[in-house]
């Protein structure tokens, strides 16, 4: 589906976006350092990891998923665990690290070109031509290159993460892409949830900064589902 | 420090013609998106539309759609909207809006009156 | 039209904390958990005050916090002060057509 290409915490396998540049694939992955796992959770070391208890994979961080830590173990007992990696093993999509996806039992990245026709399609449904000048992809707002001079300031327009300043990300917010804070601990983050398709992800927001991951808000563990925040925490 | 200021408000009849102005000094201009808003006398806040950094895209109120227009001038560092058809509803402070993350800096707007 | 709902006053004493709520739906505030707040003198024009539910722009008091909670969001001022005195309105976007959306406002009094 198209949530296991946009993983909105991230900010890193983004499609070709309304502000962006389609004819740039490779672009999703040129964010700022220390945000693309390759090898899965950074932070998930032996010495420092702390087991974190879950029903579900939205309860964990966007580099993890919820399952029971031993084979065949008891289905009760399950805890977050660090995302496979490419042609690692996997049973569904939220096993994988951002930017694949479970395809025949496996870990495989994910294929923009793929999903660009489900893309363009949650794009002139939501965007309407009636309503602005954009139509699907055929008009796109580009940026040019004099523009990369100097570091975005928060706020200005973007490609990817490697044009803002330290301490920001390239990341989507509503109409374009822009240069957004990284997040600091108790902000509000996104976990993507891969279940499902929901559209074109519009809003984005940076990742959790250094060692902070983001994880459902402690109290709102009672709430409905679809009402519950995540926040940047300690691991 | 950023600075937006705002002009060309008065009064005009309904049905008659407007445009407003909005110079932009303090930031990189070119690379913002900038939003015009509005407020009623006494009333709320209402969005009108929003111009890409490039003007490659533009959006507007279901209010205003067919009878404003939003335009930038990037080498002037200046917003537009013109006003056209206009309706006694439409009176208003009109604000232009630097929108980065929303609406993070404003101008003192400009006021506009409709009434014959 | 289209608008988040907000009490339309508020008010406290100096010290005091207050708490303004914005409603919406599962088609702007809800679906995005996403708000922003804005604060208003008379005769002047907005300040933005909190944005993406409770990040604080730079220069804005940490008086100010932002939360929310399913369609609801809610901005608390604590240790009240006079200058805090203004009107206050959430924002969101709705989903189609994308488009932002303001609260009605709500005129906090100190009292």
């Known amino acids: 589906t198209l949530n296991s290409v946009l993983n909105s915490n991230a900010i890193k396998n983004l499609p070709p976006p309304l502000g962006g540049a389609a004819g740039h694939p490779g672009s999703a992955v040129s964010a700022a350092p220390g945000i693309l796992y390759p090898g899965g959770n950074k932070y998930q070391t032996i010495d420092n990891y702390q087991p974190y208890p879950c029903a579900e994979d939205e309860e964990c961080g966007t580099d993890e998923y919820c399952a029971s830590p031993t084979r065949g173990g008891d289905a009760g007992v399950q805890i977050c665990l660090a995302c496979r990696k490419r042609r690692k093993r996997c049973m569904r999509h939220a096993m994988c690290c951002p930017g694949n996806y479970c395809k025949n039992g496996i870990c495989v990245s994910s294929d923009q070109n793929h999903f660009r026709g489900e893309i363009e399609e949650t794009i002139t449904e939501s965007f309407g031509n009636d309503h602005s000048t954009l139509d699907g992809y055929s008009r796109r707002t580009t940026l040019s290159s004099k523009m990369y001079h100097t570091k975005g300031q928060e706020g200005s327009v973007c490609l990817r993460s490697s044009d803002c300043a330290s301490g920001l990300c390239c990341a989507r917010h509503f109409w374009s892409k822009i240069c957004k804070p990284v997040l600091k601990e108790g902000q509000v983050c996104t976990k993507h949830r891969r279940k499902g398709s929901h559209g074109l992800e519009i809003f984005q927001r940076c990742y959790c900064g250094e060692g902070l991951s983001c994880r459902i808000q402690k109290d709102h563990h009672q709430a409905s589902n679809s009402s519950r925040l995540h926040t940047c925490q300690r691991h | 420090q950023v600075q937006l200021v705002e002009s060309g408000g008065g009064l005009v009849q309904p049905g008659g013609s407007l445009r407003l102005s909005c110079a932009a000094s303090?930031?990189?201009?070119?690379?913002?998106?900038m939003s015009w808003v509005r407020q009623a006398p006494g009333k709320g806040l209402e969005w009108v539309s929003v111009i890409s950094s490039d003007s490659s895209s533009t959006y507007y109120a279901d209010s205003v759609k067919g009878r404003f227009t939003i335009s930038r001038d990037n080498s002037k560092n200046t917003l537009y909207l013109q006003m056209n058809s206009l309706r006694a509803e439409d009176t208003a402070v009109y604000y232009c809006?630097?929108?980065?993350?929303?609406?993070?800096?404003w101008g003192q707007g400009t006021l506009v009156t409709v009434s014959s | 039209d289209i608008a988040l709902t907000q009490p339309a006053s508020v008010s406290g004493s100096p010290g005091q904390s207050i708490t303004i709520s914005c409603t919406g739906t599962s088609s702007d505030l809800g679906g995005y958990n996403y708000v922003s707040w804005y604060q208003q003198h008379p005769g002047k024009a907005p300040k933005l005050m909190i944005y993406d539910v409770n990040n604080r722009p730079s220069g804005v008091s940490n008086r100010f916090s932002g939360s929310k909670s399913g369609n609801t969001a809610s901005l608390t001022i604590s240790g009240l002060q006079a200058e805090d005195e203004a009107d206050y309105y959430c924002?969101?976007?709705?989903?189609?057509?994308?488009?932002?959306?303001f609260g009605g406002g709500t005129k906090l009094t100190v009292l």
């Open positions: 924002q969101s976007y709705t989903y189609t057509p994308i488009s932002p959306v």
């Open positions: 809006a630097r929108h980065g993350i929303d609406f993070d800096h």
């Open positions: 303090g930031f990189t201009f070119s690379s913002y998106w």
